[in-house]
């Protein structure tokens, strides 16, 4: 930009160096030469002279508009052509933003993720401001009224040694730019509620070489929560369609989870947990590919034909996956899979 | 209960600096986020800066590059660094709690003056 620029004269903008984007603009550039009676004041944006919409107002003073100015950064300066110079004379530059009033942020959400030490809080920011947009967390003890804020850019981490003086508290997100100040919904939040047990893995696959063969997994966590509430999900990388089983884990133990397969196909497994009857989940754990032993008997086993698990099941749901196309999102979950519902949301998914 | 008391302020010409300083009492200052604001003559409160118990900060465009937010903890004390000043920036300061608004609560403020 055009911060230290020496003026020999000045520049302004209406209805400001920072405007909402689709705004007219008047630009003026006024002269302070010595020695210089301009013949011309000329206007240039990002380096290249503007041709139109220039007018002169008096000897020392000329304005630029722009209709519906729509670049959300832009470098201007003027300069003078003095009689018997060469070269133009620079008089003047700013650099000019436009853009948005931030929207309210919504879909706040906050998680302790287990050990972490921290409450993590995100929230959607809406539609892009292209300005600098700053978001102030409020966190407020429903016990002791006192009030904490935190600056952030798009997500905060807050120490749960700050919040050391109650389990209760109101959260909301203020967002704050040059062009205006929205808040979220408030939050109610128990420190309790919002735990999401530690990492979930799947450690290890194998088939056995029964009549009937049976795939195993098995799967663990570091998670010191005692009732643990986990969902399964699996399909083999041909197919677009999840099963997914449910369990209630004690994980002072490894899991083990067996499944009767199609034969000869490569299956891709993931696990998720939350603390049984919370709200939040892990995200999916990474998938897991497992490839299944060649058929020894002729029965063509079909997934959720036969569901044996060895822990406490319920239902198997049907899932449809989305494109394959979609990037690995690792972003907390909120939702959980309804039985039979398709998969939408938040949901991370693997083709 | 909450006490805050600022100074630092005086007579500058333009594209001078100036500290100002603001020394806290009566709460749990390092969890607190501060800001400061200002009121000039014939007009009304604007807010100026703020900085969360972080060390995190947020300025307002027309101060934005030339002053500067901090806190010590140690101390108990909120400062504005006012560099590159301008006659549109005398004002009375005053700091208060929370990193953003137009308000204060009954501070004295400082006198920034800013003049040739």
């Known amino acids: 930009g055009i911060t230290s620029i020496n003026c020999s004269g000045d520049m302004w903008v209406e209805p400001g160096e920072i405007f909402q984007m689709g705004m007219n603009v008047s630009i003026y550039c006024q002269e302070a030469l010595k020695h210089c009676r301009p013949r011309n004041l000329y206007f240039y944006k990002n380096g290249f002279k503007e041709e139109f919409d220039i007018t002169r107002i008096n000897r020392t003073t000329a304005r630029i508009w722009y209709k519906g100015f729509s670049e959300p950064h832009a470098y201007m300066h003027c300069t003078a052509e003095c009689p018997g110079h060469f070269q133009e004379t620079l008089i003047c530059g700013k650099d000019i933003s436009s853009g948005h009033p931030p929207d309210a942020p919504s879909n706040l959400t906050c998680v302790i993720y287990e050990y972490s030490g921290n409450m993590t809080c995100t929230w959607n920011t809406g539609k892009p401001t292209y300005i600098d947009t700053k978001y102030i967390v409020h966190v407020k003890s429903l016990e002791t009224e006192e009030e904490q804020q935190y600056l952030a850019s798009s997500y905060v981490k807050i120490s749960t040694d700050s919040l050391q003086g109650s389990r209760k508290y109101l959260v909301w997100v203020q967002a704050v730019n040059s062009l205006g100040m929205e808040n979220s919904q408030q939050l109610h939040v128990h420190l309790d509620d919002i735990v999401i047990p530690s990492a979930s893995i799947i450690s290890r696959a194998e088939t056995t070489n029964d009549t009937v063969p049976k795939t195993i997994v098995y799967w663990k966590s570091k998670t010191m929560i005692e009732k643990v509430f986990c969902e399964m999900r699996y399909k083999t990388t041909t197919n677009q369609t999840w099963s997914v089983k449910e369990f209630d884990a004690n994980f002072t133990y490894v899991q083990q989870s067996e499944f009767y397969l199609e034969p000869d196909s490569k299956y891709v497994f993931q696990v998720r947990c939350q603390e049984t009857g919370k709200r939040n989940w892990q995200p999916w754990s990474s998938p897991f590919v497992h490839q299944t032993s060649q058929e020894t008997g002729k029965r063509n086993w079909q997934p959720w034909s036969s569901p044996f698990v060895h822990q406490t099941s319920q239902t198997v749901s049907q899932v449809t996956a989305k494109s394959s196309h979609e990037p690995q999102k690792m972003e907390m979950l909120s939702a959980t899979i309804f039985r039979g519902h398709p998969a939408s949301g938040n949901h991370q998914d693997i083709g | 209960q909450v006490q805050l008391q600022e100074s630092g302020g005086g007579l500058v010409q333009p594209g001078g600096s100036l500290r100002l300083s603001c020394a806290a009492s009566?709460?749990?200052?390092?969890?607190?986020?501060m800001r400061w604001v200002r009121q000039a003559p014939g007009k009304g409160l604007e807010w100026v800066s703020g900085?969360?118990?972080?060390?995190?900060?947020i300025y307002a465009d027309s101060v934005k590059g030339r002053f500067t937010i901090s806190k010590d903890n140690a101390k108990n004390t909120l400062y504005l660094q006012l560099n590159s000043l301008k006659t549109e920036d005398t004002a009375m300061y005053y700091c208060a709690q929370g990193v953003y608004g137009d308000t204060y609560s009954g501070s004295l403020g400082t006198q920034v003056t800013v003049s040739s």
């Open positions: 900085i969360d118990s972080r060390g995190s900060t």
């Open positions: 009566g709460f749990t200052f390092r969890l607190t986020a």
